[in-house]
């Protein structure tokens, strides 16, 4: 079980307690109810870039 406050997942993915594995955040627009999508919303996606220096 995943320890609180830690994330073993690479950028662009998030831990699913329902599946006990990292899941791709790219699937969240299609199915936002998934438990791991909360973790995806907490951090910008891998391709996110600031619009200022």
């Amino acid at each position: 079980e995943q320890a609180p406050g830690t994330s073993p997942c690479s950028s662009g993915s998030s831990w699913s307690a329902d599946l006990d594995k990292c899941m791709d955040c790219a699937s969240c627009p299609a199915r936002p109810h998934s438990d791991f999508c909360l973790g995806c919303a907490a951090a910008p996606p891998a391709h996110f870039r600031l619009l200022w220096p």
Partner: antibody, heavy 120, light 108 residues
């Protein structure tokens, strides 16, 4: 060959308890999410409960929340459903089923079912 | 909760007939729709997953289509062993899944 074998059903009085078991064989049990589904006599299928592969995450239908508890023992390849405060409307055949291997989108193997009858 | 409504509730058909069963969701579920077959006294059997993917070992006369709210299960040429009850199931809100009420396919 993948097999799921339920047991523990029977006749129980309203307010009573039962513990159902689902013994898995023919596959590695621990990576798979599992569910219980029930079917009242002559009726359709109703999802009851879900448990994650490790057992750390569980979910319940509103109709059983607070009365039923799902659990699993991966060392024994067994899924359980503890049913308390049983009501007449809980009378049904109870099936365990295995979730798909990438997500829990579908349920590819089911047990034969065990009948629970709640009656005085 | 997402409600799944199947139609018809029952139908009579003959061996060799083409049979179509529809399933409608109360809101869009994308393609997260599965179909099961159940015979009396037996457990459900997965036929189609994710709207159109045929489960391994299921005859090719079974096919599924649709997306959003409207889905179809088609049996291209009904065989004697196909007389059963068919259920759709949405997994858009997994693990909180819901089933349709079932469609019973009977012999005419």
């Amino acid at each position: 060959e993948v097999q799921l074998l339920e047991s523990g059903g029977g006749l129980v009085q309203p307010g009573g308890s039962l513990r159902l078991s689902c013994a898995a064989s023919g596959f590695t049990f621990s990576p798979y999410p599992m569910i219980w589904v029930r079917q009242a006599p002559g009726k359709g299928l109703e999802w009851v409960s879900y448990i994650s592969p490790s057992g750390g995450s569980t979910h319940y239908a509103d109709s059983v929340k607070g009365r039923f508890t799902i659990s699993r023992d991966n060392s024994k390849n067994t899924l359980y459903l503890q049913m308390n405060s049983l009501r007449a409307e809980d009378t049904a055949v109870y099936y365990c089923a295995r979730g798909g291997d990438t997500y829990f989108d579908y349920f590819d193997y089911w047990g034969q079912g065990t009948l629970v009858t709640v009656s005085s | 909760d997402i409600q799944m409504t199947q139609s018809p509730s029952s139908l009579s058909a003959s061996v060799g007939d083409r049979v179509t069963i529809t399933c409608r969701a109360s809101q869009s579920i994308s393609g997260y729709l599965n179909w099961y077959q159940q015979k009396p006294g037996k457990a459900p059997k997965l036929l189609i997953y994710q709207a159109s993917s045929l489960q391994s070992g299921v005859p090719s006369r079974f096919s599924g289509s649709g997306s959003g709210t409207d889905f179809t299960l088609t049996i291209s040429s009904l065989q004697p062993e196909d007389f059963a009850t068919y259920y759709c199931q949405q997994s858009y809100t997994s693990p909180f899944i819901t089933f349709g009420q079932g469609t019973k396919v009977e012999i005419k």
